[in-house]
Interface confidence: low
């Protein structure tokens, strides 16, 4: 069957297309090409007689068409009007006719797009920005890129106008980025230059650093204030409510206790019209800068479990300090049997249990220094059961009875394996 193949099917303006004929019959008299889906003398492009090898232009001939002996038709310098159907009419030697129709589409070569914006300096959480990809082009697809990646999914992003317009509602500082648009059609794709969105925001609540509250007399006080802001914030400092200076950093050398007070950093963004403040308390203290190592004194270091109590005392010559206790790296008190008294100087455990055995230490600290004691070991023993009351059956220890021990067993639910352990330990 006679068929026509267009190569390419989608043709760019200014390029060329070949209407390629397949299954051309043998013994031909000639053939003729027509614009459209049927044979119409008024729309004949060109005719060709094989015997004379003569090509004759028709009414629809534009001078851009070339016919080949195999009946294929080349059209050069394609224009938009060339889009559509083309019909080949074949006249065989027996004067029986055959027809076939092919088609192609013409698309413009796209120009480089550009982005227009309705707001070049949007304010965070307040403004919307609409980017429009120019120019408007028929049969083009529009795509958007943010920082060279496809658009993220967000309820604040909306595409409209056939994806030609990208709107960002309630812009945030995270929308500050590079935006590009791309136009595509079947024959070309072009990408715009970047537009950098500069979202104005802040200032956020300022942070005063360093975070220290306590200083020694004679130290230099150097405070820095920072608030995320675009454009950068203007800063000012107040001490105890009195304006000091308009700088981001405050420096006071050789401070004394008189420099104690409230330090306020004020951050202002003149473009967004917003301002924020943070207040920091500075205490210049005469506290000893180095806390001496404390010592632990124990009422006893070996005690009997479920019977004895013990008092541990953290001794220090420093004043104005606080004390905290640790046991096996855990902060105390950790049970109702443990009590702290005398401003945490004394740790009392009453009664002492098996699980209280281990290492204890105390730590003394003031706001600018701390030190800890050497550890002390508390041993917890249990009275061993008499040898004659224990018998060994399959590696288990049991009471044999006598001496009222069964009554004790019933009352105290002694754990045999523990009894066995202590028995072997002490005998």
């Amino acid at each position: 069957k006679l068929t026509i193949e267009s190569t390419p099917f989608n043709v760019a303006e200014g390029k060329e297309v070949l209407l390629l004929v397949h299954n051309l019959p043998q013994h031909l008299f000639g053939y003729s090409w027509y614009k459209g889906e049927r044979v119409d003398g008024n729309r004949q492009i060109i005719g060709y007689v094989i015997g004379t090898q003569q090509a004759t232009p028709g009414p629809a001939y534009s001078g851009r068409e070339i016919i080949y002996p195999n009946a294929s038709l080349l059209i050069q310098n394609i224009i938009q009007n060339d889009t559509g159907f083309y019909t080949l009419h074949v006249i065989k030697s027996d004067l029986v006719n055959e027809e076939a129709t092919g088609q192609f589409r013409v698309y413009p070569e796209l120009p480089k797009p550009s982005i227009s914006s309705n707001n070049s300096k949007p304010v965070e959480d307040k403004d919307a920005v609409a980017f429009t990809c120019e120019p408007e082009t028929q049969d083009a697809t529009y795509l958007w890129w943010v920082n060279n990646q496809s658009l993220p999914v967000s309820p604040r992003l909306q595409l409209s106008n056939g994806n030609r317009t990208l709107t960002l509602f309630n812009v945030t500082r995270n929308d500050s980025a590079s935006y590009k648009c791309e136009t595509q059609n079947p024959v070309s794709a072009r990408r715009s230059d970047s537009v950098i969105l500069n979202v104005l925001y802040g200032p956020d609540t300022p942070t005063i650093s360093p975070s220290d509250t306590y200083y020694r007399p004679g130290a230099n006080l150097s405070l820095s204030c920072y608030a995320a802001s675009n454009p950068p914030a203007q800063y000012s400092w107040l001490i105890n409510g009195t304006f000091q200076q308009s700088t981001q950093e405050l420096f006071i050398p050789n401070i004394t206790v008189n420099n104690s007070g409230s330090y306020t950093c004020h951050a202002n963004n003149s473009v967004t019209g917003c301002n924020r403040t943070t207040v920091k308390t500075i205490i210049v203290t005469e506290l000893s800068p180095v806390v001496a190592k404390p010592q632990i004194k124990a009422s006893k270091t070996t005690v009997t479990g479920d019977k004895d109590s013990v008092n541990l005392t953290c001794s220090t010559n420093d004043t104005g300090i606080s004390i905290r206790w640790f046991f096996k790296n855990q902060s105390l008190p950790s049970s109702e049997r443990m009590k702290l008294s005398q401003g945490n100087i004394t740790l009392s455990i009453n009664p002492v249990k098996r699980e209280d055995a281990g290492t204890y230490w105390c730590e003394v600290f003031n706001p600018i220094s701390k030190n800890q004691s050497d550890p002390i070991m508390l041993n917890v023993n249990y009275n061993a059961l008499p040898q004659e009351n224990l018998i060994n059956v399959d590696e288990q220890l049991y009471f044999q009875g006598g001496s009222g021990l069964n009554d004790i067993f019933e009352a105290q639910k002694i754990e045999w394996h523990e009894a066995r352990a202590h028995h072997h330990h002490h005998h």
């Epitope: 070049s120 060279n148 500050s176 970047s194 802001s229």
Partner: nanobody
């Protein structure tokens, strides 16, 4: 297309000076901020200085305060880094970068220019 082209690097003796330039195209430096970032072998990347030309705001790393000065000429769409009293530890590849936010640096970098401080 956004492009940043650095120049002005070279070999200089300790205590010497260099002036780096960053020529921007494809966007207007008035609409953003420009920073100089340096990368030295075995060291962390360091933001040396940045400037927001439309507001005149500048920031400097502690390591270069008092020695380096950042500036911008919006008519030439170019940023500069004047480096004085150079030290051996200033040896690095210096890159110009677009700062679209105060605290974030986008992936628009130049090709870099090498500064070597050595006697």
């Amino acid at each position: 297309e956004v492009q940043l082209v650095e120049s002005g690097g070279g070999l200089v003796q300790p205590g010497g000076s260099l002036r780096l330039s960053c020529a921007a195209s494809g966007f207007n430096i008035k609409d953003t901020c420009i920073g100089w970032v340096r990368r030295a072998p075995g060291k962390e990347e360091e933001l040396v200085a940045d400037i927001c030309p439309s507001y005149g705001g500048t920031r400097y790393a502690d390591s270069v305060k008092g020695r380096f000065t950042i500036s911008a000429d919006t008519s030439k769409n170019t940023a500069y880094l004047q480096m004085n009293s150079l030290r051996a530890e200033d040896t690095a590849v210096y890159y110009c970068a677009i700062v679209s936010k105060i605290d974030q640096y986008y992936n628009y970098w130049g090709q870099g220019t090498t500064v070597t401080v050595s006697s």
